[in-house]
């Protein structure tokens, strides 16, 4: 079931999925000046069975000005550095991608991919948060969020993370005011 909701935004933090649950969709988006090839896939879809999961379909972009289709090429390392995504860039690996059954790894880049990847997560997906460079983490609990479904509505749990500037004097974690759970919906309720 799709999460009709976005992971919570934490000031000065970014999130990343270490692996993607089966059913996750990734939009085939192209950078400015390029478009999906005609009859090309709209999405990549994480599919599989109990032993192996992989991304169905391939995203392909072609120049908006020409009719030529582009091939699937992995960008050179210097090109990859330019790719800005909604995910964290640092090598934070709390979970080994390969060790999670029913999950797909991060799909490789495709040529002329858009700068931001748009994922459609499913219920049960977990994302991990990390403070951006120049900020440090004050933890009150796990810096992760899970998409849950309650009464047919989906919500993400609130990650217990506060990112503070290196130079700022901050309260102890225990003195922080508790943040409201996302969407103002109850945190603990997961079944009806």
């Amino acid at each position: 079931e799709l999460c009709d909701d976005d992971p919570p935004e934490i000031p000065h933090a970014t999130f990343k999925a270490m692996a993607y649950k089966e059913g996750t969709m990734l939009n085939c988006e192209c950078k400015r000046g390029f478009r999906r090839i005609k009859s090309g896939s709209l999405y990549m879809l994480c599919t599989g069975n109990s032993s192996h999961s992989s991304w169905d379909n391939q995203c392909q972009c072609t120049s908006s000005a020409t009719r030529n289709t582009t091939k699937q090429v992995t960008p050179q390392p210097e090109e990859q550095k330019e790719r800005k995504t909604t995910e964290m860039q640092s090598p934070m690996q709390p979970v080994d991608q390969a060790s999670l059954p029913g999950h797909c790894r991060e799909p490789p880049p495709w040529e002329n991919e858009a700068t931001e990847r748009i994922y459609h997560f499913v219920v049960g997906q977990m994302v991990y948060y990390q403070c951006v460079q120049g900020y440090r983490a004050l933890h009150r609990g796990p810096a992760e969020s899970v998409c849950k479904m309650t009464h047919g509505k989906t919500r993400w749990t609130q990650p217990q993370l506060i990112c503070t500037g290196e130079m700022e004097t901050s309260q102890f974690p225990g003195e922080e005011k508790p943040q409201a759970s996302p969407e103002g919906r109850p945190e603990s309720e997961t079944s009806c």
Epitope: E1, D4, M25, L42, V122, H151, G152, T154
Partner: antibody, heavy 116, light 106 residues
Framework: QVQLVQSGAEVKKPGSSVKVSCKAS????????MHWVRQAPGQGLEWIGY????????QYNQKFKDKATITADESTNTAYMELSSLRSEDTAVYYC?????????WGQGTLVTVSS | DIQMTQSPSTLSASVGDRVTITCSAS?????MHWYQQKPGKAPKLLIY???NLASGVPARFSGSGSGTEFTLTISSLQPDDFATYYC?????????FGQGTKVEVK
Amino acid sequence: QVQLVQSGAEVKKPGSSVKVSCKASGYTFTSYRMHWVRQAPGQGLEWIGYIRPKRGYTQYNQKFKDKATITADESTNTAYMELSSLRSEDTAVYYCARGGGVFDYWGQGTLVTVSS
Amino acid sequence: DIQMTQSPSTLSASVGDRVTITCSASSSISYMHWYQQKPGKAPKLLIYTTSNLASGVPARFSGSGSGTEFTLTISSLQPDDFATYYCHQRSTYPLTFGQGTKVEVK
């Protein structure tokens, strides 16, 4: 209580455009996606797409990608859907529905009639 | 796209009848949701996540199924139940609905 109130019925000429509004109240507008659904006369329901009011990000059913443009105005808690290059087959009732999972609240519907 | 096929398209029944509507998905989905619609009105959520009754929905309605085959049952049809019923999947984009089953008076 949650309410979605849509704009009134419209009669339009082929080739013109129409903008349907959906004013939300009774909940935090930016906390839920707003979806749009179409129902042609005597037909079933078709999902058009949604908007995330907070970021303005939209996702469309490919069938409606060149037909519908969904926008939102946080200041008035209103979602909009503009339909362009209208044709007789665009005659339908258009509904907004609150997302966040199943569609638990719907607008009353806006009938758009395209006729020369 | 996941196609949703409801059967029957029209169902003639009498008050007190047990009514069953089936919905078949072209691919396996995690849950099915059901809506009820009356003429000139917006659809109303009836059953969510296959078998859970929405708020205020009478217990004569029930839902079941898994994978590609799902069922909506009305154990004893009441006058207020004559309407059109739609199944709906939100397991993958685009979200899709069945073509509808109209329950009419026999």
